[in-house]
Interface confidence: medium
Amino acid sequence: GITIPRNPGCPNSEDKNFPRTVMVNLNIHNRNTNTNPKRSSDYYNRSTSPWNLHRNEDPERYPSVIWEAKCRHLGCINADGNVDYHMNSVPIQQEILVLRREPPHCPNSFRLEKILVSVGCTCVTPIVHHVA
Amino acid sequence: GITIPRNPGCPNSEDKNFPRTVMVNLNIHNRNTNTNPKRSSDYYNRSTSPWNLHRNEDPERYPSVIWEAKCRHLGCINADGNVDYHMNSVPIQQEILVLRREPPHCPNSFRLEKILVSVGCTCVTPIVHHVA
């Protein structure tokens, strides 16, 4: 295993709530500098399982705006541009960590929260249940 | 914008780094109780743009292991189960927040970081560039 010596410059942990409540630097570092600037942006229209993006806003949350994908069709778009109901458009879901102000309306106190968001849609072969 | 009255019970914000450094309760709250129990889990095999999951590990990050989707094919799977190169499998990407220990190896001081992860793949019609 990797052995990690404790850093002698670590902050003090005498706080009675330690270690549940910690200091977090919100000066967010973005590791995405080399990524494609298009960021999948037109895929929602070009996909065989296209989706619409719906805005979800919550001022007590960081990030306050989250865009949610909703599949446009139950089926998938075929080569003729029609909906093929022998296939299914399904949302790809992902949990994300967000910060929620706690107590509410406090500018400098948060709680980590997991929420589930739909990022986009993909076209899948349906699971067919045969009735005896 | 929405104006939020300040809660009189908020923690003190005299810290010289305020508001960049905030208190965060890491006792993660899960808002996902009413969600679809399928966890999108078998879509990576059933999709017409299937993907594999690749492991990315970093012991100084939470979560330390992130499984990234990599599309299996350049094209998409057609009704015959063959790869159709007239369509493209593309990754759906999403930014997520992770926590990084800062300074390194300290158990109670963190920095938020945004990273881009590929969540799954979708099948899109290619953009065809016609050469004059």
Epitope: G1, I2, I4, S13, F18, P19, R20, V22, I92, Q93, Q94, E95, L97, K114, V119 | L26, I28, N32, T33, T35, P37, K38, R39, S40, S41, Y44, L53, E57, D58, P59, E60, R61, Y62, P63, S64, V65, I66, W67, I96, R101, P107, N108, V117, V119, G120
Partner: antibody, heavy 126, light 107 residues
Framework: EVQLVQSGAEVKKPGSSVKISCKAS????????ISWVRQAPGQGLEWMGG????????DYAQKFQGRVTITADESTTTAYMELSGLTSDDTAVYYC???????????????????WGQGTTITVSS | EIVLTQSPDFQSVTPKGKVTITCRAS??????LHWYQQKPDQSPKLLIK???HSGSGVPSRFSGSGSGTDFTLTINGLEAEDAGTYYC?????????FGQGTKVDIK
């Protein structure tokens, strides 16, 4: 390959304490949870508590609160469980188990035990 | 705390037979239910995570299903090496809890 290797069996007197170690190898120790689960003879599994070295905190089952202390040393990739005020009811096999801390297929996956130690038998007898 | 109740407590099955074990949670836990196998004098081993996903190196004869409060572990084509005790487990909320176990033996 991930391995959790526990310290050896011990015989203890009632009222005394015991401290068991669990040495992890083959994975990034700090970012995984380590839980302790015990099994009395012929009985089922009982969760005692766990620690996430990354955050430095421990959680305990109410039944053991005040009697159990779980710690971890990242420099040696070892977790410890100390149980005090031992009685004959504490005679059991004690397991450490790793709780993954992964973002898997779109989910934060942190609530099951993917690897277990070999177990440490603690016998409490006068 | 969340109580997990397994049934049956004991099952005796012939080789190549089918085993079905159910686990009921006292409240909705989504799909946060896991199954472990414990052979005599061995540590438990993860079989199924998140109700239906196989653990590493688990044979395909083991499968899981269910969500909410009702879950099932199925062994199709029981082999002699499958004898042991099977436990369900939830980590949806603390404390972690386990079912009381189902002992499976081979006739």
């Amino acid at each position: 390959e991930v391995q959790l290797v526990q310290s050896g069996a011990e015989v203890k007197k009632p009222g005394s304490s015991v401290k068991i170690s669990c040495k992890a190898s083959g994975g990034s120790f700090g970012s995984y949870g380590i839980s302790w689960v015990r099994q009395a003879p012929g009985q089922g599994l009982e969760w005692m508590g766990g620690i996430t070295p990354f955050f430095g905190w421990a959680d305990y089952a109410q039944k053991f609160q005040g009697r159990v202390t779980i710690t971890a040393d990242e420099s040696t990739t070892t977790a410890y469980m100390e149980l005090s005020g031992l009685t004959s009811d504490d005679t059991a096999v004690y397991y450490c188990a790793r709780e993954p801390n992964e973002f898997w297929n779109g989910y934060y996956s942190t609530d099951h035990f993917d690897y277990w130690g070999q177990g440490t038998t603690i016998t409490v007898s006068s | 705390e969340i109580v997990l109740t397994q049934s049956p407590d004991f099952q005796s099955v012939t080789p190549k037979g089918k085993v079905t074990i159910t686990c009921r949670a006292s409240q909705d836990i989504g799909s946060e239910l896991h199954w472990y196998q414990q052979k005599p004098d061995q540590s438990p081993k993860l079989l199924i995570k998140y109700a239906s996903h196989s653990g590493s190196g688990v044979p395909s004869r083991f499968s899981g299903s269910g969500s909410g409060t009702d879950f099932t572990l199925t062994i199709n084509g029981l082999e002699a090496e499958d004898a042991g005790t099977y436990y369900c487990h939830q980590g949806f909320s603390l404390p972690h809890t386990f079912g009381q176990g189902t002992k499976v033996d081979i006739k």
